[in-house]
Interface confidence: low
């Protein structure tokens, strides 16, 4: 048999120790047993229905879940903190008859050096500090325990862990004398698990790191991690995958190239390249192993570590999106887009497509859009007809069907789903844009005009008159 | 510092058992696993088990599962292990060891172990 | 059970000499989670074994920079690349991917 300790010996799932998946007890809720399928294969939809339905209509007898608010608890173990000291935490809400847990991993860009850390923690302390934090949380999108705004997991166990490590969930350094700052994102998360492994994460049978933005790269740094750190701490049975949203950047070359002053203006690759020196950062083994030293930074990029991780990872992307433009020092500041810059905007969207290829499990509309898990109208957005909570039901199907060793995709299941059409908001659903100066409303044509696309040019590959594209974006088609 | 202390020598009859001591000092018990290696005098080293302290789990080498029986104590950081129905063959050295991030990075110095009537 | 074959046996050298140890494995020892947890100790007279490279190539802390580790799947190898004095003793490899975990027999390193 194979090994299944610490971080050598994560083998094959033996049987359970004795704390780890006992049955329940007398009157304890069981969340999950065997369903045969295969009778309502052909009417999966509305079998889903049905259930939904039926989920909804018991859903008032919880009283449990009456209280949407996710509650703070700082960590006991006080050496691990946020940017200035102080401790690090987490907020819980409960589920005491499920055994999933979603832990969701905050973003909020970094800092990495000494200047844009003093002045991050002026302008932003929430993202460095914990001293005022509030006592809870209100659990939004798939952070939501009702069914109708979370049909993927609304009865999870929800965990908030909130960033204030400013080191892309990175980081192993504490503060001392010599350093202002401490760095512990990579240690937050292990302390958390530690610390929910008392609360009932033990008895777990998938956890789900999420995350958003650097929480997304957070997620794909730390998601093997976290899985080795279950069997090393006994619990090899729980079954550990990522799900990063906006979270998957390019080091592409910058539209306009600028010095690395500050946060926004820094190449990617050369923000990163500091900040890993600065936090102490530490990536993937599997990923560290593939480049040199001093070259760890490749590692916080999705297309290059992603090939590396063990465990599954759903990633989720918009193809045009916000915090990469912006990186790439692309302002959208109303005035007509110039011919170079709608080109190199398409581009990105085809290079982003590109890197998804070979990711099986991926949901990229073709929006200029930042982040997507948590707003409470994540259920909107379709790709190819699929929103991302169906998206991700049919990657729980096939992660629960692969022991049959079938490779193909489940009949009306998709998981892979990326936008084929080539400009912003050319997916009629995306989530509606706003004049940045007037707020006003914008539908996808008067957005594309503003931008300065060119209907004739926009219409042109697709075999339309510029009026017919029109009529068709208008009507949301 | 890390350390892990063994008492040097044990002395027992044909047919008796054991319970040899580690006592783990300089860092946190509970997350790290302790291995057990034999060594019998002019021989290598052979893996026995290991135990995590953290939640009770245990791997045996299927060769000594009837023989020993690992088990530890948290509140004062201490592993064991219990060897039963002891035999010549059983004269041995016997190593703890703490397994740290994949390695078996510390040692005890050892218990020598004599079988003798 | 996975058995770790180390040869030589003995290995006399000269001191500032270049030595080198071979571990073969009897399966490959890749781990599932792609790791390789192959590992050399260091066993000198009347002393415990002490860590010398962890996953095959990595120096635990403290080693000099001499002891040096390569190989895969099935094949390892352990070089000291200027034999000193406190270098003398026997060397062990060692496989914690599968278990039960294994030793090699030992290999010897003496004096010319």
């Known amino acids: 048999s194979e090994g299944r300790k610490t971080w050598r010996r994560r083998g094959q799932q033996p049987p359970p120790p004795p704390r780890t998946e006992a049955a329940p007890a007398a009157g304890q809720p069981v969340e999950s047993f065997p369903l045969d399928f295969t009778a309502v294969e052909g009417n999966m939809d509305s079998f889903m229905a049905q259930v939904k339905s039926l989920a909804q209509s018991l859903y008032p007898c919880s009283a449990q879940q009456l209280n949407e608010d996710l509650r703070l608890h700082l960590l006991l173990n006080t050496s691990v903190t946020c940017n200035d000291g102080s401790p690090a935490g987490y907020y819980l809400k409960e589920s005491r008859g499920s055994r999933r847990w979603l832990l969701f991993l905050e973003g909020g860009w970094y800092c990495f050096n000494r200047e844009n850390c003093d002045s991050r923690y002026d302008t932003m302390r929430r993202l460095m500090s914990s001293r005022d934090w509030p006592r809870t949380r209100t659990g939004t999108g798939i952070l939501s325990s009702q069914p109708e705004e979370n049909p993927y997991w609304w009865n999870a166990n929800m965990v908030f862990i909130p960033y204030c490590s400013s080191d892309v969930w990175s980081g192993a350094s504490s503060k001392s004398e010599k350093n202002e700052y401490a760095f512990m994102g990579a240690l937050i998360i292990q302390e958390v698990v530690r610390e929910l492994l008392g609360r009932g994460l033990s008895g777990a049978k998938v956890l789900l790191l999420a995350g958003s933005s650097a929480g997304g790269t957070g997620v794909l740094l730390n998601v093997d991690r976290v899985a080795e750190q279950l069997e090393k701490l006994g619990y090899p049975a729980i079954q550990v995958r990522g799900l990063a949203d906006s979270g998957w950047f390019l080091d592409n070359k910058q539209y306009r190239h600028t010095d690395c002053v500050d946060t926004i203006t820094c190449a990617p690759t050369e923000a990163i390249r500091r900040g890993i020196r600065y936090w102490n950062g530490v990536v993937p083994e599997r990923c560290r192993r593939q480049f040199q030293e001093g070259e760890e930074w490749n590692c916080f990029f999705g297309y290059k570590v992603y090939p590396t991780l063990r465990c599954p990872v759903f990633v989720v992307q918009w193809l045009f999106d916000e915090a990469q433009l912006t990186v790439d020092n692309v302002h959208l500041t109303g005035q007509p887009v110039q011919e170079g810059l709608r080109l190199y905007i398409q581009n990105l969207g085809r290079e982003l497509r590109h890197t998804l290829k070979d990711v099986p499990a991926s949901f990229a509309p073709a929006c200029l859009s930042h982040e997507i898990i948590i707003r409470s109208h994540w259920t909107d957005v379709q790709v190819k007809g699929t929103s991302l909570p169906r998206a991700l039901h049919c990657w729980d199907r096939s992660l629960h069907d692969s022991h049959k060793a079938s490779k193909t995709p489940l009949k009306g299941c998709p998981v892979h789903l990326v936008d084929s059409c080539p400009w912003p908001h050319c997916n009629p659903s995306c989530p509606t844009v706003r004049d940045q100066f007037t707020g006003q409303e914008m539908n996808v044509a008067q957005f594309l005009m503003h931008m300065g696309f060119d209907m004739q040019t926009v219409a042109q590959p697709q075999g339309l008159e510029p009026s017919e594209l029109l009529g068709m974006l208008s009507n949301g088609s | 510092q890390v350390q892990l202390q063994q008492p040097g020598a044990e002395l027992v009859k044909p047919g008796a058992s054991v319970k040899m001591s580690c006592k783990a000092s300089?860092?946190?018990?509970?997350?790290?696993?302790i291995s057990w290696v034999k060594q019998r005098p002019g021989q290598g080293l052979e893996w026995i088990g290991d135990f995590y302290p953290g939640s009770g789990r245990t791997d045996y080498n299927e060769k000594f599962k009837t023989k020993a029986t690992l088990t530890v104590d948290t509140s004062s950081s201490t592993a064991y292990m219990q060897l039963s129905s002891l035999t010549s063959e059983d004269s041995a050295v016997y190593y703890c060891?703490?397994?740290?991030?994949?390695?078996?990075?510390?040692w005890g110095q050892g218990t020598t172990l004599t079988v003798s009537s | 059970d996975v058995l770790m074959t180390q040869t030589p046996l003995s290995l006399p050298v000269s001191l500032g000499d270049q030595a080198s140890i071979s571990c073969r494995s009897s399966q490959n020892i890749v781990h599932s989670n792609g790791n390789t947890y192959l590992e050399w100790y260091l066993q000198k007279p009347g002393q415990s074994p002490k860590l010398l490279i962890y996953k095959v190539s990595n120096r635990f802390s403290g080693v000099p920079d001499r002891f040096s580790g390569s190989g895969s799947g099935t094949d390892f190898t352990l070089k000291i690349s200027r034999v000193e004095a406190e270098d003398l003793g026997v060397y062990y490899c060692f496989q914690g991917s599968h278990v039960p975990y294994t030793f090699g027999g030992g290999t010897k390193l003496e004096i010319k």
């Open positions: 060891s703490r397994d740290g991030h994949g390695e078996g990075d510390y």
């Open positions: 300089g860092y946190t018990f509970t997350r790290y696993w």
